[in-house]
């Protein structure tokens, strides 16, 4: 006659986090008398998951009614699976005996892998703004996924980037993993409306990748170009001088007029016009009373943009 066999038909199963895992186990005989126990892992450090004889296992239910006469199905269902539940589960038959149970036979084991979705990617840019032609770094992080295989791509306005480095941690086996990637992006003057996108694809996402975005408007600073022009005379003694401040971003801008090096007026940009590329234009004008000046006047338009060192443009006003 054949001795009892413990049959675990599934070599491995994969379950999504939050779902239930069913671990199958049948025995071929009701003898010897004694309980079935389920363990995660093998050896002295194995973890007891379920004991037919005694104990309270709130997450575990048996698939069959173990009080039924002739029951040989000792499959269990573990609810609310998390990545921490991953491992190899063994169905073990014990033989009733004093002083303690004697392990009689073990199943071959079922490896449970847990599919856990990555967290939404978080993209962060540099702490300080940078100007066009400069290269800036963006980082993308996503956590808590399993299995380890994952694909990360970077895009700028729909165009895939190639200059990036990605790490998945830890390198060895773990219940869940994290990904960290750094991409280098060269800024252009047209990038105010641009977006950098980090896209993460994983088996748990069923072909619908997760995306994290960063707006380059948070990163870029486009310095203004200045033009000072003298307008036709308005009245006999007055000349209108304008300072055109063009193509700047962000809005924060302060303008100071200087007459022969002396501060004439300081104003903060208010009514701005926005360009299609997201930059701004602003114009300031100064009425100069020519009769108050005996000599030629040097008019300077000085602009401090976004806390940066001032830039200026001068215009010489001839007094005839």
């Amino acid at each position: 006659e054949e001795e009892l066999q413990v049959i675990q038909p599934d070599k491995s199963i994969s379950v999504a986090a939050g779902e239930s895992a069913t671990l199958h186990c049948t025995v071929t005989s009701l003898i010897p008398v004694g309980p079935i126990q389920w363990f995660r892992g093998a050896g002295p450090g194995r973890e007891l998951i379920y004991n037919q004889k005694e104990g309270h296992f709130p997450r575990v239910t048996t698939v069959s009614d173990l009080t039924k006469r002739n029951n040989m199905d000792f499959s269990i269902r573990i609810s609310n699976i998390t990545p921490a539940d991953a491992g190899t589960y063994y169905c073990v038959k014990f033989r009733k005996g004093s002083p303690d149970h004697v392990e009689f036979k073990s199943g071959a084991g079922t490896e449970l892998s847990v599919r856990a979705k990555p967290s939404a990617p978080v993209v962060s840019g540099p702490a300080a703004r940078a100007t066009p032609q400069h290269t800036v770094s963006f980082t993308c992080e996503s956590h808590g996924f399993s299995p380890r295989d994952i694909t990360l791509k970077w895009f700028k306005n729909g165009n895939e980037l190639s200059d990036f480095q990605t790490n998945v941690d830890p390198a060895g086996d773990s219940v869940s993993y994290s990904i960290h990637s750094t991409a280098k992006v060269v800024l252009t003057r047209e990038d105010v409306h641009s977006q950098v996108i980090c896209e993460v694809a994983h088996v748990t996402l069923q072909g619908d990748p997760l995306r994290g975005t960063a707006n380059l408007s948070e990163t870029i600073r486009v310095p203004p170009t200045l033009e000072v022009t003298q307008q036709p005379v308005r009245a006999e003694n007055q000349v209108n001088v304008t300072c055109q401040v063009r193509k700047f971003y962000p809005q924060r801008l302060q303008l100071t007029w200087l007459e022969n090096g002396n501060v004439s007026r300081t104003e903060t940009a208010s009514t701005l016009t926005e360009n299609k590329d997201g930059t701004y234009n602003w114009m300031s004008w100064l009425l100069v009373n020519v009769s108050a000046h005996r000599d030629d006047v040097k008019l300077t338009c000085q602009v401090e943009h976004d806390g940066q060192p001032a830039v200026s443009k001068s215009h010489d006003l001839k007094v005839s």
């Epitope: 054949e2 001795e3 004889k53 006469r69 033989r95 009733k96």
Partner: antibody, heavy 115, light 111 residues
Framework: RQLVESGGGLVQPGGSLRLSCTAS????????ISWVRQAPGKGLEYIGT?????ITYFASWAKGRFTGSKTSSTAYMELSSLRSEDTAVYFC????????????WGQGTLVTVSS | DIVMTQSPSSLSASVGDRVTITCQAS????????LAWYQQKPGQAPKLLIY???TLATGVPSRFSGSGSGTDFTLTISSLQPEDFATYYC???????????FGQGTKVEIK
């Protein structure tokens, strides 16, 4: 589904006997067969359980004198060094106790030990 | 070895009565539930009524019920029927696989 015992009878003190328990309608291969006896006018007494190979065990008082074996259809129990106090009806039942209780039972076979 | 003590050893009751038989183990039975109840009528083999302390065997009328855990167990017949007059035995299992002991029996007779 039934069990039928046979092999009982009159035996002299010190003698031996082989009891059989034959299953009809089901297989014994995945079950133990337990033996229970009942002396005239007395209660039930567990003797032992016959499983596969090494999985055969007897109550402490029966060890040594009683042995057993089993095929897929018949279980056997050998009684040796019989004494007058072994006179009883011997029942076999399918099961090993706990979650595999004794059910069904055979009708019993009477063993009389007397000179 | 585990010792099972049944009480009473006999009782007289009428049809329709509620009957309770108790069984006490000298130590906790295996798994706190290795306790079965059997019914035996004269000249017949015993018949399984209850196992695992409270699980009703197939085909047994629902007037029979079992309860208890550890060392103290009860068989209850909620409304005694004429066919229930018999002797009832508990069978308790200890921690060793060969340690199975019957109680001495309770004879239920007609009053």
């Amino acid at each position: 589904r039934q069990l039928v015992e046979s092999g009982g009878g009159l035996v002299q003190p010190g003698g031996s006997l082989r009891l059989s328990c034959t299953a009809s309608g089901f297989s014994l291969s995945s079950h133990g067969i337990s033996w229970v006896r009942q002396a005239p006018g007395k209660g039930l007494e567990y003797i032992g359980t016959i499983g596969t190979g090494v999985i055969t065990y007897f109550a402490s008082w029966a060890k040594g004198r009683f042995t057993g074996s089993k095929t897929s259809s018949t279980a056997y129990m050998e009684l040796s060094s019989l004494r007058s106090e072994d006179t009883a009806v011997y029942f076999c039942a399918r099961g090993s106790a706990w979650n595999d209780p004794f059910d069904p039972w055979g009708q019993g076979t009477l063993v009389t030990v007397s000179s | 070895d585990i010792v099972m003590t049944q009480s009473p050893s006999s009782l007289s009751a009428s049809v329709g009565d509620r009957v309770t038989i108790t069984c006490q183990a000298s130590q906790s039975v295996y798994g706190n539930n290795d306790l079965a109840w059997y019914q035996q009528k004269p000249g017949q083999a015993p018949k399984l009524l209850i196992y695992l302390a409270s699980t009703l065997a197939t085909g047994v009328p629902s007037r029979f019920s079992g309860s208890g855990s550890g060392t103290d167990f009860t068989l209850t017949i909620s409304s005694l029927q004429p066919e229930d007059f018999a002797t009832y035995y508990c069978l308790g299992g200890g921690d060793d696989e060969a340690d199975n002991t019957f109680g001495q029996g309770t004879k239920v007779e007609i009053k």
